[in-house]
Interface confidence: medium
Amino acid sequence: GHSLFTCEPITVPRCMKMAYNMTFFPNLMGHYDQSIAAVEMEHFLPLANLECSPNIETFLCKAFVPTCIEQIHVVPPCRKLCEKVYSDCKKLIDTFGIRWPEELECDRLQYCDETVPVTFDPHTEFLG
């Protein structure tokens, strides 16, 4: 299992090459641990494999295996990144019949600078 309210090292292979190496669970979709997140991510692999957006891998990892810094500051993907990826990939999302999780609907995410991400306390944001 994972330790409550502390960052943990990333073990999902696809996301181990990201610029961050610590994550926190549950994620935005409520997946309890990395093994579940890895399985759920597989539905989106056609998008990653076909590289429909330059940012697809970054977005999927930030959504399913969120960045965690300073123990309990969890960083969800920013809205602008979400909008770009969704727009770039919409044709393939439709083609493959991929269900875009409502938790990842872009208008639910905050505008923020990807380099200086908005952080929030998972006690209230993820579990509330």
């Epitope: 590289e51 330059p54 940012n55 891998e57 909008e83 770009k84 969704y86 727009s87 919409k90």
Partner: antibody, heavy 123, light 107 residues
Framework: QVQLVQSGAEVKKPGASVKVSCKAS????????MHWVRQAPGQGLEWMGR????????NYAQKFQGRVTMTRDTSTSTVYMELSSLRSEDTAVYYC????????????????WGQGTLVNVSS | DIQMTQSPSSLSASVGDRVTITCRAS??????LNWYQQKPGKAPKLLIY???SLQSGVPSRFSGSGSGTDFTLTISSLQPEDFATYYC?????????FGGGTKVEIK
């Protein structure tokens, strides 16, 4: 403002290779695919392929497969297009073009273009 | 590969004329069609994307329509700066392909 600045004109002999550069500025380099399009004298436009500056992933037109290589240097926001085994029919202006998105969900057009690089292949 | 056929290949028109250029795809491309304007010695300029969306900064006299296989670029009132070559391009699938171009000349 967005700018794509390409390297200068080249004269090459048949069988040689040419490497054209395209330096991007004014936007986040890794956010947009970069495409290469060429135009032979008095002819139309021909798509050669594209590179994902984020991952380095490429997608080449079948016609150029095995002869073209697209690379990028994220530290300088520059993409490169190398074409090998040149022949006279490769004489053309080579353009890099950035593919942006418009929130329309479509595969968008090329909204910014380099100034073009003339490659003359002649013996 | 998807073939893009433009017509006419050239046309002569006067300032103020309404000009229509057509583009036909060899298979359905939905609305994944773009239009470009190119002047001699210059890079192409994006006018219309997604068949009918006007690119930012492009005058409203340019408009695009169509879906599936048949598309149209219309210039409602030709201006002196509009004399150029126009290309359609499909962005439905790779390889991305362009029409052969339509040269708009002064009558």
């Amino acid at each position: 403002q967005v700018q794509l600045v390409q390297s200068g004109a080249e004269v090459k002999k048949p069988g040689a290779s040419v490497k054209v550069s395209c330096k991007a500025s004014g936007y986040t380099f890794t956010n947009n695919f970069m495409h290469w399009v060429r135009q032979a004298p008095g002819q139309g436009l021909e798509w050669m392929g594209r590179i994902n500056p984020n991952s380095g992933g490429t997608n080449y037109a079948q016609k150029f497969q095995g002869r073209v290589t697209m690379t990028r240097d994220t530290s300088t926001s520059t993409v490169y297009m190398e074409l090998s085994s040149l022949r006279s029919e490769d004489t053309a202006v080579y353009y890099c073009a950035s593919q942006n998105y418009y929130g329309s969900g479509s595969y968008p057009g090329f909204d910014y273009w380099g100034q073009g690089t003339l490659v003359n292949v002649s013996s | 590969d998807i073939q893009m056929t433009q017509s006419p290949s050239s046309l002569s028109a006067s300032v103020g004329d309404r000009v229509t250029i057509t583009c036909r795809a060899s298979q359905s491309i939905s609305s994944y069609l773009n239009w470009y304007q190119q002047k001699p010695g210059k890079a192409p300029k994006l006018l219309i994307y997604a068949a009918s969306s006007l690119q930012s900064g492009v005058p409203s006299r340019f408009s695009g329509s169509g879906s599936g296989t048949d598309f149209t670029l219309t210039i409602s009132s030709l201006q002196p700066e509009d004399f150029a070559t126009y290309y359609c391009q499909q962005s439905y699938s790779t390889p991305l392909t362009f029409g052969g171009g339509t040269k708009v000349e002064i009558k």
